[in-house]
């Protein structure tokens, strides 16, 4: 169940832990506090999951009923171009934006939005339902 | 590099419409929203409204009857538009690209006398 | 809406001197949110300060901003020329986002 790479997706997931949201195959958590991106990153890390990491424009719309107007960290940085945390790139948008501060990626109901790594927002882990599973 | 570059009229006739085009160059519409204020010399600095990377718009109570943002992401271009324009609405609109946690670079500005 | 006043409206100081300008909210702001701008005579405004305290890209250190709450301020330690500008202060942190009515800082 749920067994192939890091970044592979996980099939027929029973139930999320507490406090985590089942939607499809994975378990998302939504944060109540807010933390910098880095922290964000090894609050998910440290819980077996990974700041979420969006497949596809479905996923991201179905994602964003449940956002609100406040930003939320996912898994989206701007190293020469936006780039997901598992790799791939972030393709509808091509262009880099270059600015003189690190650009992480946020979410809200609104969609996609650049920010200052450093801002403190909520985030949104993503993982399988098995600690030990696929992270995407 | 970061730029946001504005066209449209300086000069609008009492009762008509404005409309101002800003076209981004260095960052992507998909991954920033876009801002508009104004500045007029009587009341400081407004801000109008936004559109969001993902199409959505907030305008401000103050002026959500009148105006209209829209975009096109793949000509990177911003659209504003705001109808029945009288003289307290002339000022100076800018069009300002977001990035968390503050409004970054700022267009040009685009000076609009309204007078007939 | 958040109302920011900032005060002076109006400032002059020599140069070498140390200026200090105030920004104050009718409700709390977050200093994640707070930012300053400065502008010139026929230039858009430019992030000067944001998040209370930090620099923008090529901004000289000797301007510092703090601040928490509802009160807040901008103050540069020693007045250069180039500093002479309107700074305004700024949230972002509730729509209708807010600007106050800035500080016109001159050389004396």
């Known amino acids: 169940l749920c067994q192939g790479s890091n970044y592979s997706t996980c099939a027929s997931c029973p139930s999320c832990p507490d406090r985590w949201m089942k939607y499809g195959n994975h378990c998302y958590y939504f944060s109540v506090e807010e933390k910098d991106w880095n922290s964000s990153l090894e609050f998910c890390l440290a819980r077996d999951s990974h700041l979420l990491v969006i497949t596809d424009n479905q996923e991201m719309s179905l994602l964003q009923v449940f956002l609100s107007e406040a930003f939320c960290w996912i898994g989206l940085r701007n190293n020469s171009g936006w780039r997901w945390e598992d790799g791939s790139p972030l393709n509808f948008s091509r262009i880099s934006s270059n600015s003189f501060v690190q650009t992480c990626g946020a979410i809200n109901k609104n969609g996609l939005q650049a920010s200052s790594c450093e801002v403190p927002l909520h985030w949104v882990c993503k993982k399988c339902p098995f600690a030990d599973q696929a992270l995407f | 590099q970061v730029q946001l570059k504005q066209s449209g009229p300086g000069l609008v006739q009492p009762s008509q419409s404005l409309s101002i085009t800003c076209t981004v160059s260095g960052f992507s519409l998909t991954t920033h929203a876009v801002h508009w204020v104004r500045q007029s010399p009587g009341k400081g600095l407004d801000w109008l409204g936004v559109?969001?990377?993902?199409?959505?718009?907030d305008y401000n109570a103050a002026f959500i009857s009148r105006l209209t943002i829209s975009k096109d992401n793949s000509k990177s271009q911003v659209f504003f538009k705001m109808n029945s324009l009288q003289a307290d609405d002339t000022a100076i609109y800018y069009c300002?690209?977001?990035?968390?946690?503050?409004?970054?670079?700022w267009g040009q500005g685009t000076s609009v006398t309204v007078s007939s | 809406q958040i109302v920011l006043t900032q005060s002076p409206a109006i400032m002059s100081a020599s140069l070498g001197e140390r200026v200090t300008m105030t920004c104050t909210a009718t409700s709390s702001v977050s200093s994640t949110y707070l930012h300053w701008y400065r502008q010139k005579p026929g230039s858009s405004p430019k992030l000067w300060i944001y998040?209370?305290?930090t620099l923008a890209s090529g901004v000289p250190v000797r301007f510092r901003g703090s601040g928490s709450g509802t009160s807040y301020s901008l103050t540069i330690s020693s007045m250069e020329a180039e500093d002479a500008a309107t700074y305004y202060c700024?949230?972002?942190?509730?729509?209708?986002?807010?600007f106050g009515g800035g500080t016109k800082l001159e050389i004396k």
């Open positions: 559109i969001w990377s993902g199409g959505n718009t």
């Open positions: 998040s209370t305290s």
């Open positions: 300002v690209r977001l990035l968390l946690p503050a409004m970054d670079y």
């Open positions: 700024h949230q972002y942190r509730r729509s209708p986002y807010t």
